[in-house]
């Protein structure tokens, strides 16, 4: 709390300008009118105020707007945004994408801070859903943004927004998140032809069920091993050797290098050894010839 003192003669600020950097904290408090500051917030960004001086300016705005700043002020906060706490931001009502962009720009190049996370949360909740323009903006600033959302939050993403998603945006997504995103992607890209469809859907396949993988195996897609290794184990297990061979195409040779890792390891354990031998890769661990394979999941379904 800055002590209230009278403004020295001749120092009353008539505008927010560069001369204010030479004011002491108490002079800023006494000589800068809060309403003047609010209307000229855009100028603050061009002035090299110290953090202590920014604290005073923030304090003045807090006094002027105890219920939260109006968007006209928020949009021009610039690096004063870095002084805001999540509690401050929760009082805001940010509806303009331009305001969001302006504040994300201030934090650009840094990790997502609690302030930014709160800002995004307020913005998305205000909009009701994560529309394409918002998603475009957020993933441009934070490629990992999508994967920071819970499956519940992801369920509010409309399929049309999926077009904004780049492969790198999904790098840190876990299977539960991809389970939510995959059906949306499938819907979004449904009118594309085979090869184009595969290029777009590839990043989302960690959420694909067995039947979709079987369908893809009929389309000469030549899935790379990196994508195959990210598939759900439970979706890969029912695939036959022939289906996996078709799915991977020339990349099938890569299975040898991955035979000790999931899902390849678990898939090998489910295949007949003589079927695996047809690949000529020396994969070991399949079911020996003459053994009966009981599909317990089918047994349960029938009983």
């Amino acid at each position: 709390e800055v002590e209230k003192t009278a403004c020295p003669s001749g120092k009353k600020a008539r505008e927010i300008d560069e001369s204010l950097i030479f004011y002491k904290k108490w002079e800023l408090e006494a000589c800068v009118d809060a309403a003047l500051l609010a209307t000229q917030m855009d100028r603050v960004n061009a002035i090299p105020f110290t953090y202590e001086q920014l604290d005073v300016l923030k304090h003045k705005l807090d006094e002027l707007y105890p219920q939260g700043y109006p968007e006209s002020v928020i949009q021009h906060l610039g690096y004063l945004f870095l002084k805001m706490s999540p509690e401050d931001i929760r009082k805001w009502n940010v509806t303009s994408l331009e305001t969001l962009k302006a504040l994300l720009e201030v934090n650009k190049g840094h990790e997502m801070s609690p302030q930014v996370a709160t800002l995004i949360d307020r913005f998305v909740k205000g909009r009701g859903q994560l529309d394409k323009d918002t998603l475009d903006t957020l993933t441009a600033f934070y490629p990992g943004y999508l994967c920071s959302l819970s499956p519940e939050e992801l369920s509010s993403v409309p399929p049309s927004s999926i077009w904004a998603v780049r492969p790198q945006d999904l790098d840190t997504c876990d299977p539960r998140q991809l389970d939510v995103l995959y059906p949306k992607a499938r819907l979004a890209f449904q009118n594309m032809n085979g090869s184009e469809y595969f290029v777009k859907i590839q990043s989302f396949l960690g959420g694909a069920p067995t039947e979709d993988l079987k369908a893809l195996s009929q389309q000469n897609v030549s899935m790379d091993l990196a994508t195959f290794m990210k598939l759900r184990t439970d979706a890969v297990l029912p695939l036959t050797v022939a289906e996996v061979q078709k799915l991977l195409g020339p990349h099938v040779e890569g299975l040898k290098a991955e035979e000790r890792h999931r899902p390849v390891r678990d898939w090998i354990l489910r295949q007949r050894q003589d079927d695996l031998d047809t690949l000529g890769l020396g994969l070991q661990g399949g079911i020996p010839n003459g053994y009966l394979v009981l599909d317990l999941s089918m047994q349960e379904a029938l009983s």
Partner: nanobody, 114 residues
């Protein structure tokens, strides 16, 4: 990687002049350029500032003696220091705000002997 390179510091007699310069490279749209100084055992203080609009402002202690200017084409800011006094002895550091982000130079030593 933004770089600010200062030059022009040195040893000068009281009443003499020096011209400091600070060149910014790999930088975006510059909003303001300023000079700060820190004397031994004291806090860093602003000396002069020039904005993108060309308006300038000075600390009371240097008014009438120091002049700040900038060359936009070269992304360079200058500080012409005349009538130097021993109390102007300090490390002078340039500060630039570009695309709403602040950057500091390494500093250049100015020593004024009596």
């Amino acid at each position: 990687q933004v770089q600010l390179v200062e030059s022009g510091g040195g040893l000068v007699q009281a009443g003499g002049s020096l011209r400091l310069s600070c060149a910014a490279s790999a930088i975006g749209s510059i909003n303001s350029m300023s000079w700060y100084r820190q004397a031994p055992g004291k806090q860093r203080e602003p000396v002069a500032v020039i904005t993108d609009r060309g308006s300038t402002s000075y600390a009371d202690s240097v008014k009438g003696r120091f002049t700040i200017s900038r060359d936009n084409a070269k992304n360079t800011v200058y500080l012409q220091m005349n009538s130097l006094k021993p109390e102007d002895t300090a490390i002078y550091t340039c500060h630039v705000i570009a695309d709403w982000r602040g950057y500091w130079g390494q500093g250049t030593q100015v020593t004024v002997s009596s």
